[in-house]
């Protein structure tokens, strides 16, 4: 009988140890959850405050409606210009409308005067069609005014208030474009 009692006592003790372990695990888990929650809340607060404090466009970029534009201060060939824009998560300018063209040319007049600026327009070597980099065709009013006589690849650029074409390997300034951040109010 004594042996039976001690066996029960041992089983109870074992159960108690298991429950203590479970409680300890639960406490640890709860603490871990609380820490994670704190981290998540801090992360969200930081994100929200930085989003609230940040302007829709980065420094030295110009905003118009939903877009941000960067007018370069260096010259490069068309392909390098494209890569320079990608480095900032943007692309060479794609002009969608006459209103956007007017804004760009107006801004350029204020900033720099009459220089050449690469945009994201190039001519397909086979068909001769003009294409923006996303594969769309420019609207009829936004086709380059002159056809370049170059045997090499031909790309589009803006000068004054015109869209023109030139050998992609010539050096020009360039304009990058990306979406403006939405203000979180």
């Amino acid at each position: 009988k004594l042996l039976q009692v001690s066996t029960i006592a041992m089983q109870q003790q074992e159960k108690l140890i298991q429950q203590e372990r479970a409680l300890l695990n639960f406490t640890e888990w709860k603490r871990s959850c609380a820490l994670q929650m704190k981290y998540c809340q801090a992360f969200m607060q930081n994100s929200l405050s930085s989003a609230h404090n940040s302007s829709p466009c980065p420094n030295n970029w110009i905003q118009n409606r939903e877009s941000c534009y960067y007018v370069s201060e260096i010259w490069s060939i068309w392909h390098t210009s494209q890569e320079n824009c990608l480095k900032e998560g943007s692309t060479l300018l794609q002009i969608e409308s006459k209103e956007e063209m007017d804004f760009i040319t107006g801004s350029l007049r204020k900033i720099k005067g009459s220089y050449d600026y690469w945009v994201g327009l190039s001519q397909d070597g086979h068909s001769g069609r003009w294409l923006w980099q996303d594969g769309s065709s420019p609207s009829p009013g936004l086709l380059p005014a002159e056809r370049s006589q170059s045997a090499n690849q031909v790309c589009g650029y803006v000068k004054s208030n015109s869209l023109l074409s030139s050998n992609c390997s010539t050096w020009k300034y360039f304009i990058c474009e990306k979406y403006a951040l939405r203000s979180s109010v």
Partner: nanobody, 117 residues
Framework: QVQLQESGGGWVQPGGSLRLSCAAT????????IGWYRQAPGKQRELVAS???????NYSTSVMGRFTISRDDVKNTVSLQMNSLKPEDSAVYYC???????????WGQGTQVTVSS
Amino acid sequence: QVQLQESGGGWVQPGGSLRLSCAATGSIVSINAIGWYRQAPGKQRELVASITNQGIRNYSTSVMGRFTISRDDVKNTVSLQMNSLKPEDSAVYYCKGFAGWGKEDYWGQGTQVTVSS
């Protein structure tokens, strides 16, 4: 540090399709855009498609309408779906992660694509 690893290359007949994948590991928040480049023997490396962190896609005129670039932010991968492949598409394909101005960009090791009958 960011590591990029391409996969999915191989041999395919003209008119066939391949899907390349570029997996990014490390501090990928520093990447503003990913581009797929290709280099055929004796030719310069050319950018064929790119996608920015805002999801803006660009293509070179030589692949427009045939190649599609896409990204999966959960898996941290950028894919290049290549359809209607031509022998002139044969090259080593590399993915490149564009960091900000004045920062060093990241390159993968490359994957070979061969289009021939």
